[in-house]
């Protein structure tokens, strides 16, 4: 049934990136107002982003309490005044969002190369450990503490004066690669969980190459 | 005429439960959100929670989340405020409201119910 | 949250003269699309439920006297009471309904100088 003159929300998309997550829907608002609710599926309806004007809903509070569970959202369109003087008192319209699970399916956001240091051919370079939404005791967790081996980085890595690129792979933070001494490279990394079947690689972090400021990857 | 009756406050130890109601006449209740405000002793109004004409959706101030569960009957015309876990900063008149022109636009207030929580 | 900003806290005003009472929210609760303020003024007498004078900043809910008015926009507002009649003194309040947990000033005494 559903109260005249609203209209269902419809396109409703999950907007995550480590674990910050937004429902996004159409359309935009007019004469009417939504309210979303979020549920694991063996748990109750809780209502987020009450009477709302706005077409996204962070839900990031809710889904880092358990990121592994699977979560459904719906949103409920209710029109824009009290039902007496707008339409009936029927089941308000509604549509649901497409499950979701944030450890499975949540973006992983660009990383960042921390520091690279060598010693004779070695290089050691390290990646930041960003920092989540999610929380354990109070303390905001990192990426590797919520993922651990499931969460691996690949380095790609070539000399400045070279566009043959090489590639190394880690399950930790730090990369120990050979290298030709005299010679200064360039490093790129990218997150990645080889055991997903979406979203298992993160764009590539910002270019870093020794002996210069941040430089760009050139084919 | 609107009228908005509420009932079930009381004085109460910390930690134990009290269940308000409010009794609404003269409109048609199952079309109106309504909410829960609270006005402690000389102090200003707070807002505690909303329900929505159907029901379904509820929110609530974070002061009341998880202790407080507002829900209504439509077939009786009554909105009820079940509070646990009671604590001294709970002592307050509450007062039930009805969703006026806009959600949130109170056109109408019960005269309210003393909810006092003391050992 | 929203947080609303009443001044003065009190007021003492000579009958027949003009109270004015501001109140500012921390973020604006103008909704561009209709261009409507979502705030709302209420009166609250001793021992009674506060009473809505005016919502959507400006607009005088049915049966309020047109000494009382509201002006605005976005995180500034003014309730003025034109002329103080005896039966005005009370505690004036403003609220936010843009967005939620809905918040109210702390409240503004008027009083009969």
């Known amino acids: 049934s559903g109260t005249t003159n609203t209209v269902a929300a419809y396109n409703l998309t999950w907007k995550s990136t480590n674990f910050k997550t937004i429902l996004e829907w159409e359309p935009k608002p007019v004469n009417q107002v939504y309210t979303v609710q979020i549920s694991t599926k063996s748990g109750d309806w809780k209502s987020k982003c009450f009477y709302t004007t706005d077409t996204e809903c962070d839900l990031t509070d809710e889904i880092v309490k358990d990121v592994k569970q699977t979560y459904l959202a719906r949103v409920f369109s209710y029109p824009a005044g009290n039902v007496e003087s707008t339409g009936s008192a029927g089941e308000p319209l509604y549509e649901n969002s497409p499950e979701f699970t944030p450890y499975l399916e949540t973006n992983l956001g660009q990383p960042t190369i921390q520091s690279f240091e060598q010693v004779g051919t070695k290089v050691n370079v390290t990646v930041e450990d960003e920092r989540t939404l999610v929380r354990k005791n109070g303390t905001f967790l990192t990426l590797r503490q919520v993922f651990g081996n499931d969460l691996g980085y690949i380095l790609t890595y070539r000399k400045s004066s070279s566009s043959g690129k090489k590639t190394a792979k880690t399950n930790t933070n730090e990369f120990l690669i050979d290298v030709d001494k005299g010679e200064n490279y360039c490093f790129s990394v990218q997150a990645v969980i080889p055991s997903r079947t979406v979203n298992r690689k993160s764009t590539d972090s910002p270019v870093e190459c020794m002996g210069q400021e941040k430089g760009e990857f050139r084919e | 005429q609107v009228q908005l009756v509420e009932s079930g406050g009381g004085v109460v130890q910390p930690g134990r439960s009290l269940r308000l109601s409010c009794a609404a006449s003269?409109?048609?209740?199952?079309?109106?959100?309504m909410h829960w405000v609270r006005q402690a002793p000389g102090k200003g109004l707070e807002w505690v929670a909303v329900?929505?004409?159907?029901?379904?959706?509820?929110y609530y101030a974070d002061s009341v989340e998880g202790r407080f569960t507002i829900s209504r009957d439509n077939s009786k015309n009554t909105l009820y405020l079940q509070m646990n876990s009671l604590r001294a900063e709970d002592t307050a008149v509450y007062y039930c409201?009805?969703?006026?022109?806009?959600?949130?636009?109170?056109?109408?207030w019960g005269q309210g119910t003393l909810v006092t929580v003391s050992s | 949250d929203i947080v609303m900003t009443q001044s003065p806290d009190s007021l003492a005003v000579s009958l027949g003269e003009r109270a004015t009472i501001n109140c500012k929210s921390s973020?604006?609760?103008?909704?561009?699309?209709?261009?409507?303020?979502?705030l709302a003024w209420y009166q609250q007498k001793p021992g009674q439920p506060p009473k809505l004078l005016i919502y959507?900043?400006?607009t005088r809910e049915s049966g309020v006297p047109d000494r009382f008015s509201g002006s605005g926009s976005g995180t500034d507002f003014t309730l003025t009471i034109s002329s103080l009649q005896a039966e005005d003194v009370a505690v004036y309040y403003c609220q936010q309904f843009h967005s939620y947990p809905l918040t109210f000033g702390g409240g503004t005494k008027v009083e009969i100088k």
């Open positions: 973020q604006s609760v103008l909704f561009s699309s209709n261009n409507k303020n979502y």
């Open positions: 003269g409109f048609t209740f199952r079309s109106y959100g």
């Open positions: 409201a009805r969703d006026g022109v806009y959600y949130g636009v109170y056109d109408y």
């Open positions: 959507w900043a400006s």
């Open positions: 329900i929505t004409y159907d029901g379904i959706n509820k």
